[in-house]
Amino acid sequence: MKVLQEPTCVSDYMSISTCEWKMNGPTNCSTELRLLYQLVFLLSEAHTCIPENNGGAGCVCHLLMDDVVSADNYTLDLWAGQQLLWKGSFKPSEHVKPRAPGNLTVHTNVSDTLLLTWSNPYPPDNYLYNHLTYAVNIWSENDPADFRIYNVTYLEPSLRIAASTLKSGISYRARVRAWAQCYNTTWSEWSPSTKWHNSYREPFEQH
């Protein structure tokens, strides 16, 4: 039994890191393998993660971690019984994928303005809480070409757009994702989408 693709890990910079790897053949990850991990810290202890299958030869492990700080470094040991298959390390702050925003809501009762709000996925004491920026994706269910991205570079988790920038009388969907420039993170997954019917009063045309 050998590792074909070494484990690569990403952290949500809060409490979970996800590691994925591939073996050289079909493997029952949960029965044959264990990923041991430990924070390099005087008061830490070793933990064991039981991996799950992720395709025939692929394995994935969700590591429960202490609150992350930038200096953290974890040792990782992948075992098959008594055999050490791979040894490595992982700095969560260097491989961050933020959590997805939640509670996306479209408020359509503000005159002819659409107000989209969502929740920051981090608690106020987490470093990323004040460092997230967002991308909002709005698209038409009727017209695949009607697809747009709004970059929200301020900290407030909201976006205002004129309803008239979208077509009236049809349904739209929106979703939002996050990233943090400070740690050069990847984008989060998209939030669940929310749907609304866009309607507004056309301006009176004078002839």
């Epitope: 810290f41 202490d66 700080v69 930038s70 200096a71």
Partner: antibody
């Protein structure tokens, strides 16, 4: 807002015992290492003890064998049991959250050791 | 055990002046594990700088940290009245634990 609220200081005779408490709020207590740091009157800061999220502990040589740090994650609380107290243990004791450094501190509680 | 020595013991300056505080370690310290604190009379210490040069949340940008190896510096670019206090450096070591310097008092001249 992260808060650490301390209680349990007071006057004790040499050789006596005292238990300090620290209640945390505004953060996930169970995912953070916790510490005690003290400051003798007019002196500098001295690290006393620390406890990891899994219960691993460490002590300064000056208190080893006399002090015991513990935590109750269900109550978001940190404790320091101090036995065989000496005159040199007299100080303001601070609880703190942290790891390699201490990012949040309690208000401090004075422990006076005097006959 | 790593010993941290701060200098000077006392720094007498006027508001608006630049303050430079030194922290020297008896052996090499990882920059990731070097921090600075401010303490005012009757108050708990407050984290200013961690990782030798990163400002903690809410700390004004007049505070900056630098250095590596055995020599570290805290600089206050322009002293405000509220900056007069005692400053401590602190390091963490995987075997020896946590140690503080003896402190530098920044007082009004």
């Amino acid at each position: 807002e992260v808060q650490l609220v301390q209680s349990g200081g007071g006057l004790v005779h040499p050789g006596g015992s005292l238990r300090l408490s620290c209640a945390g709020s505004g953060f996930t207590f169970s995912r953070n290492a916790m510490f005690w740091v003290r400051q003798a009157p007019g002196k500098g800061l001295e690290w006393v003890s620390g406890i990891g999220t899994g219960g691993a502990t460490s002590y300064a040589d000056s208190v080893k064998g006399r002090f015991t740090i513990s935590r109750d994650n269900a109550k978001n609380s940190l404790y320091l049991q101090m036995n065989s107290l000496r005159a040199e243990d007299m100080a303001v004791y601070y609880c703190a959250r942290g790891r390699y450094y201490f990012d949040y501190w309690g208000q401090g509680t004075l422990v006076t050791v005097s006959s | 055990e790593i010993v941290l020595t701060q200098s000077p013991g006392t720094l007498s300056l006027s508001p608006g002046e630049r303050a430079t505080l030194s922290c020297r370690a008896s052996q090499s310290v990882s920059s990731s594990y070097l921090a600075w604190y401010q303490q005012k009379p009757g108050q708990a210490p407050r984290l200013l700088i961690y990782g030798a040069s990163s400002r903690a949340t809410g700390i004004p940008d007049r505070f900056s940290g630098s250095g590596s190896g055995t020599d570290f510096t805290l600089t206050i670019s322009r002293l405000e009245p509220e900056d007069f206090a005692v400053y401590y450096c602190q390091q963490y070591d995987h075997s020896a634990g946590w140690t503080f310097g003896q402190g530098t008092k920044v007082e009004i001249k």
